[in-house]
């Protein structure tokens, strides 16, 4: 068979450069006085999502309804992959963590063009919608490096929920400091393959 | 309601050239790679050719490489499908499929065929 | 090139349970999806990734992939279920079709 393709994004080089990668240049971003948030991403980040138990994520979207599948994937099935695009966040976060002079990253999570991962704070949901820039506060999460390669999401609309899995779905999750930070339903696993 | 009509089909002597055209609605085409299927006179369905982004993933059928070219035109919501040095064996109804779901950022057909067209029919005879 | 192997006939009575086998190497490995092909129509999705059902289709069709086999079951089978029914896969991808399975509904 023939085939040819090719995509057009920008990435750091592997996961274990990127934190520190993208520290620098938001600190250069941020002596330089620009303002990050809304306008365009430090850096983008094309990534397969999947959970701390090696489930993969998997979005179904047409155009007028989807559902975001939490599963074992077959092994002959290509992984999905998010555009992952890193801002700086006006606001700290409610837990210290992956930032620079005490702010943090924060992420925007997409899918395919136009559409991006929104919090549902009302319906605790994940949801996905299609916007237009600038993109609206539900849809940028607070990003924390974890331990094991591991993420977490946190809603910047409502510290302390995080993005997390529930009954094999995307579900929002409100986390309890003193007890669950290392809660495993709320850690991922980005993955260039 | 997702629409897709074929066009272009007829007859065309052997070594000959046609090309298709399915024209799509109801939905966002560029969002949704596109594939051709076709079926010759009393026989099974044969992918033949799909498109994901424009232009830069294609993919083809090994009967078919080096003599079709499937293309798309977002801003005209159609998919194309150039066949060239046409051979008898190419005699079918050709339909234009497009995929159940968006594309992902991974790339590549994202399968299955969750809409058809009506199909147009291509007769290759001298 | 992959090969998917179906039954070229099956028969059954009204009311009764129909199933159409896809046979491919590792076929488990991989999604499945089956269309239904009424005569002079064009194919029909009926079931994809292996199980699911688009909307519209009754829930009379359903769906299960393992091993080498993938399975495609009608119960209480109707009159406006006779049809040809193909089984695909997607493999690196490029689409692949079984051959073709004809219900004839007695």
């Known amino acids: 068979m023939h085939h040819h393709h090719h995509h057009h994004h920008h990435h750091a080089a592997g996961l274990n450069d990127i934190f520190e990668a993208q520290k620098i240049e938001w600190h250069e971003a941020a002596i330089e006085g620009r303002s990050i948030t809304g306008i365009s991403p430090i850096t983008e980040y094309l990534a397969s999502l999947s959970t701390y138990n090696d489930q993969s994520i998997t979005f179904a979207l047409e155009d007028e309804s989807y559902e975001i599948y939490v599963e074992d994937l077959k092994k002959d099935k290509k992984k999905d992959k998010v555009l992952l695009s890193y801002y700086e966040s006006q606001h700290p976060s409610s837990e210290s963590g992956d930032g620079v002079d005490g702010k943090m990253l924060m992420v925007t999570l997409s899918p395919t063009k136009d559409f991006w991962l929104q919090a549902n704070n009302k319906e605790h949901s994940v949801e996905l919608h299609k916007c237009e820039k600038p993109l609206p506060d539900q849809a940028f999460f607070v990003l924390h490096n974890r331990s094991f390669n591991c993420v977490s999401f946190e809603c910047k609309t409502d510290p302390g929920v995080f993005i997390g899995v529930k009954d094999n779905h995307l579900a929002l999750i409100k986390v309890d400091y003193s007890e669950n930070l290392g809660s495993e339903n709320i850690l991922f696993k980005l993955s260039e393959i | 309601e997702v629409q897709l009509l074929e066009s272009g089909g007829g007859l065309v002597q052997p070594g000959g050239s046609l090309r298709l055209s399915c024209a799509a609605s109801g939905f966002t085409f560029s969002s949704y790679a596109m594939s051709w299927v076709r079926q010759a006179p009393g026989k099974g369905l044969e992918w033949v050719s799909g498109?994901?982004?424009?232009?830069?993933?294609?993919y083809y059928a090994d009967p078919v490489k080096g003599r079709f070219t499937i293309s798309r035109d977002n801003s005209k919501n159609t998919l194309y499908l150039q066949m060239n040095s046409l051979r008898a064996e190419d005699t079918a109804v050709y339909y234009c499929a497009r995929d159940l779901w968006m594309m992902n950022y991974a790339g590549g057909l994202r399968y299955p065929f969750g809409y058809w067209g009506q199909g147009t029919t291509v007769t290759v005879s001298s | 090139s992959y090969v998917l192997t179906q039954p070229p006939s099956v028969s059954v009575s009204p009311g009764q349970t129909a199933s159409i086998t896809c046979s491919g190497e590792?076929?488990?490995?991989?999604?499945a999806a089956w269309y239904q092909q009424k005569p002079g129509q064009s194919p029909v999705l009926v079931i994809y990734r292996d199980t699911k059902r688009p909307s519209g289709i009754p829930e009379r069709f359903s769906g299960s992939n393992s091993g080498n086999t993938a399975t495609l079951t009608i119960s209480g089978t109707q009159a406006i279920d006779e049809a040809d029914y193909y089984c695909g896969v997607l493999k690196q991808d490029t689409g692949v079709f079984g051959g073709g399975t004809k219900v004839t509904v007695l």
């Open positions: 590792r076929m488990g490995d991989k999604y």
């Open positions: 498109i994901a982004d424009d232009f830069t993933s294609t």
